[in-house]
Amino acid sequence: GITIPRNPGCPNSEDKNFPRTVMVNLNIHNRNTNTNPKRSSDYYNRSTSPWNLHRNEDPERYPSVIWEAKCRHLGCINADGNVDYHMNSVPIQQEILVLRREPPHCPNSFRLEKILVSVGCTCVTPIVHHVA
Amino acid sequence: GITIPRNPGCPNSEDKNFPRTVMVNLNIHNRNTNTNPKRSSDYYNRSTSPWNLHRNEDPERYPSVIWEAKCRHLGCINADGNVDYHMNSVPIQQEILVLRREPPHCPNSFRLEKILVSVGCTCVTPIVHHVA
């Protein structure tokens, strides 16, 4: 592969914990400015597997606020607007990175953490187990 | 309430950029160890709005690999297994935090970045615009 030389302007990395402990600038750069405005849509209401959103708050985490989806029904909404229990509403989950204050209550020291969040719901055909 | 003082073991915060630049331990703590193993499931195949997963790789980002969902069809799969174009498969998107090497190619200096990723797809009723 292509060898990219290390930038000579990098901060000193002679720290005994390197590269486990790094410096992170919290001034967030937003890459989403030109994204499709439809992304913030009302899919949660219009889906055949609709969901509600709950504000999950943890002040020792960065970001401290994460919105979590919970499917409204076990089944899916059919063409008549009724819940069809022959299908299943299931959460689509994603593993994301967050920062956890470590040691606790420290304003400028964090540890990376992986958490699982439910982003929305989708309608799936159930797995049917046939009894012999 | 209980008074929790600031932890005396916190790193020094007299940095002029505080709290914009913080220390982060990259030894990831995984909170998902006891989660349902079904989360890494076959929902992408069983959904009425199935999707494929594409590997998005960027060596200047942490994590460098992110899997992105792309809906397989414009419509949704009906009970007969055919695509029904009266319904729409749409991506469920989520804004996530990643670390971007800054300055570029530095192993121990990052900046937080918000990016938008498609996690999966859901089936929605289309918005119909009636022409007068």
């Epitope: 913030s40 708050e57 960065y62 401290s64 606020v65 209550h105 | 209980i2 929790i4 600031r6």
Partner: antibody, heavy 119, light 107 residues
Framework: QVQLQQSGAELVRPGASVKLSCKAL????????FHWVKQTPVHGLEWIGV????????AYNQNFRDKATLTADKSSSTAYMELSSLTSEDSGVYYC????????????WGQGTALTVSS | NIVMTQSPSSLSASVGDRVTITCKAS??????VGWFQQKPGKSPKLLIY???NRYTGVPSRFSGSGSGTDFTFTISSLQPEDFATYFC?????????FGQGTKLEIK
């Protein structure tokens, strides 16, 4: 530039309901949380609740759960707060404010809507 | 709920004076504290966020410090336009709560 424009002062009868509005200008409405705050001389500033226009999610202060209902209309970039079963205790100035979810602070505030509940 | 106890409730000072307001949280709120200025008939205006960060366009005479439970807001040299009411507020955890305010008056 960013502006939050709130609806005008309201005088309503006890027992009635009222719907206050807050129109967002100068930024993408769906990108930030909207919070509502009540101010009275007796209780000072009290946080009512939050709505995320991007995903429709809401959360409320327990003290206002049966009083306030938060909604948002993306097409007009407007957030609403409906207050029901009004009593004189609900009189005060109501503010909408934008919350930067990642950064964690309120930056812009509306000019406020004065609500008077009186017979 | 986290209680924010602000003191003093009122304060008389002269132009050029150095003024300090304190806020004590009933439990640790890390650095998640903001300070607001409010003039009669107007909405609150953000001055300081994350305990010590001056918001965009805020003059350097305004400063904040503290972490955990004890926070301080200082105006180094009072200007005529600074006479107003000042509030502290925690956004560490909801319900977000405010101090009762400090009314800064001309001596």
């Amino acid at each position: 530039q960013v502006q939050l424009q709130q609806s005008g002062a309201e005088l309503v009868r006890p027992g009635a309901s009222v719907k206050l509005s807050c129109k967002a200008l100068g930024y993408t409405f769906t990108d930030y949380e909207f919070h509502w705050v009540k101010q009275t001389p007796v209780h000072g500033l009290e946080w009512i609740g939050v709505i995320h226009p991007g995903n429709g999610g809401t959360a409320y202060n327990q003290n206002f759960r049966d009083k306030a209902t938060l909604t948002a209309d993306k097409s007009s970039s407007t957030a609403y707060m409906e207050l029901s079963s009004l009593t004189s205790e609900d009189s005060g100035v109501y503010y909408c404010t934008r919350f930067l979810t990642y950064e964690g602070y309120f930056d812009y505030w509306g000019q406020g809507t004065a609500l008077t509940v009186s017979s | 709920n986290i209680v924010m106890t602000q003191s003093p409730s009122s304060l008389s000072a002269s132009v050029g004076d150095r003024v300090t307001i304190t806020c004590k949280a009933s439990q640790s709120v890390s650095i998640d504290v903001g300070w607001f200025q409010q003039k009669p008939g107007k909405s609150p205006k953000l001055l300081i966020y994350h305990a010590s960060n001056r918001y965009t366009g805020v003059p350097s005479r305004f400063s904040g410090s503290g972490s955990g439970t004890d926070f301080t807001f200082t105006i180094s040299s009072l200007q005529p336009e600074d006479f107003a009411t000042y509030f502290c507020q925690q956004d560490y955890s909801s319900p977000y709560t405010f101090g009762q305010g400090t009314k800064l008056e001309i001596k």
